[in-house]
């Protein structure tokens, strides 16, 4: 996350951090008890690595006692996604057993009625991915709040040059904004799960180049024929 | 698959006003910019300006900007361009394009001749 | 404003014939998001433009290989490696960096 701040911990008790060999890889949201939601484009060059699920961290390091590592009994990305393109960037991750709930460990209600929100809509965007252009990691949960922008700018040529479909949407990027390792997080507004960070190589914090998140409600009907 | 169809070109006199429309379909109107170009006859292209259908944010190029105006009806999927006080210098092929991605999706143009 | 000088104006070549156009900006055109917004359209007489090229040197869906774009900074290319007989048309370089966007005032390619 670029020119946010640390995030209250525990305050996101539906944060997960992706990991690759024990180490933070993509952010992810639980969206049910035993389901995580995150990128596919974070699965890519994982090959034979083991994939686990962190709940309940504020910090990535330290023992914190709603802190616990889970296992990956199966991992499911949108058939469609390519490893070329943003589209589809969607990746569901069965946990082995099903999510020890409480106070830092919750799912967050995603949305269903596929409708835009409106730019200009504050949304936070949370996760563990780098902090400045130098590629520096947090150990702690950082966070932001961006505006949604409209899809019309965000598709313009000096901006995304018309790769914003309407399943995906865009939030302002002007110095504030996710960045790699965000990447599967989520975007919340008025506290429901609107937009998942894409996966890509986007430079992050120019304006020009806004951020790009894939709409769940969009998916809804994938989402839930893969949680069914 | 995306079509522009521009229309209301015609023979004005100078002096004149008219109202060319352009109507979008194949994709969601509100999602792209559209421009609007010109090309008098044997001439070059020539950007008129654009204009944001979510908000309706216009940019014009300095030499259109006091006698042409954008519109829209999102409603209809169709953007407007009003031009007023024409002169036989903005006899032209008026074309409307989509921004994004570059300016792929034209229309088929509509003549606009300024004559009396 | 930006300017964009095309040469030649005009050309005439042979079907098979390599063509080389040129396309002079009067200031950088590098985006301030580090990107070059150059592109080339071609235009057949009672038509709307087509996008060939957009970025420098990225072709557009369905255009042909035989059409290539390359520069940077100022100086920018358009090369048909065998001119085709569809290929006889006006083509004009585009800037959409800084507005207001400008076109270059085209090279019409004739048959000889």
């Known amino acids: 996350i670029l020119g946010g701040r640390e995030a209250e911990a525990h305050a996101r008790p539906y944060m997960a951090s992706v990991q690759l060999n024990g180490a933070h890889l993509c952010g992810g949201v639980l969206v049910a008890e035993q389901w995580v939601l995150s990128a596919a484009h974070c699965l890519e060059d994982a090959a034979d690595g083991k994939v686990q699920v962190l709940l309940g961290a504020h910090s990535l390091s330290q023992p914190e006692p709603s802190k616990r590592l889970y296992d990956v009994l199966r991992a499911v990305p949108h058939p469609d996604s390519q490893p070329d393109t943003i589209d589809h960037d969607l990746l569901l991750l069965q946990l082995s057993e099903k999510a020890t709930l409480g106070p830092a460990v919750r799912p967050l209600p995603w949305q269903r009625v596929d409708r835009d929100v409106a730019p200009g809509t504050l949304c936070d965007v949370a996760g563990w991915g780098i902090v400045n252009h130098a590629g520096r990691r947090p150990d702690s949960l950082q966070h932001v709040l961006l505006p949604v922008l409209d899809r019309a700018t965000c598709n313009r040529r000096t901006h995304h040059d018309g790769a914003i479909t309407e399943r995906l949407m865009c939030a302002e990027s002007n110095r504030r904004d996710s960045c790699k390792g965000d990447s599967g997080g989520p975007l919340v507004c008025g506290g429901v799960l609107e937009g998942v960070v894409t996966s890509g190589s986007r430079v992050c914090g120019n304006r020009k180049k806004p951020g790009i998140y894939t709409r769940v409600a969009s998916y809804a009907a994938w989402i839930d024929s893969v949680l069914a | 698959e995306v079509q522009l169809v521009e229309s209301g070109g015609g023979l004005v006199q100078p002096g004149g006003s008219l109202r060319l429309s352009c109507a979008a379909s194949g994709y969601t109107f509100t999602d792209y910019y559209m421009n609007w170009v010109r090309q008098a006859p044997g001439k070059g292209l020539e950007w008129i300006g654009d204009i944001n259908p979510v908000t309706g944010d216009t940019d014009y190029n300095a030499d259109f900007k006091r006698r042409f105006t954008f519109s829209l009806d999102t409603s209809k999927s169709t953007a407007y361009l009003q031009m007023n006080s024409l002169r036989a210098e903005d006899t032209a092929v008026y074309y409307c394009?989509?921004?994004?991605?570059?300016?792929?999706?034209w229309g088929q143009g509509t003549l606009v001749t300024v004559s009396s | 404003d930006i300017q964009l000088t095309q040469s030649p104006s005009s050309l005439s070549a042979s079907v098979g014939d390599r063509v080389t156009i040129t396309c002079r900006s009067s200031?950088?055109?590098?985006?301030?998001?580090?990107?070059?917004?150059l592109e080339w359209y071609q235009q057949k007489p009672g038509k709307a433009p087509n996008l060939l090229i957009y970025?420098?040197?990225n072709r557009w869906s369905g255009v042909p290989s035989r059409f290539s774009g390359s520069g940077s900074g100022t100086d920018f290319t358009l090369t048909i490696s065998s001119l085709q007989p569809e290929d006889f048309a006006t083509y004009y370089c585009?800037?959409?960096?800084?507005?207001?966007?400008?076109f270059g005032q085209g090279t019409k390619v004739e048959i000889k």
């Open positions: 585009f800037q959409g960096s800084h507005v207001p966007v400008t």
């Open positions: 394009t989509r921004e994004g991605p570059s300016f792929a999706y």
């Open positions: 200031q950088t055109i590098v985006h301030d998001n580090g990107d070059t917004y």
């Open positions: 970025k420098v040197s």
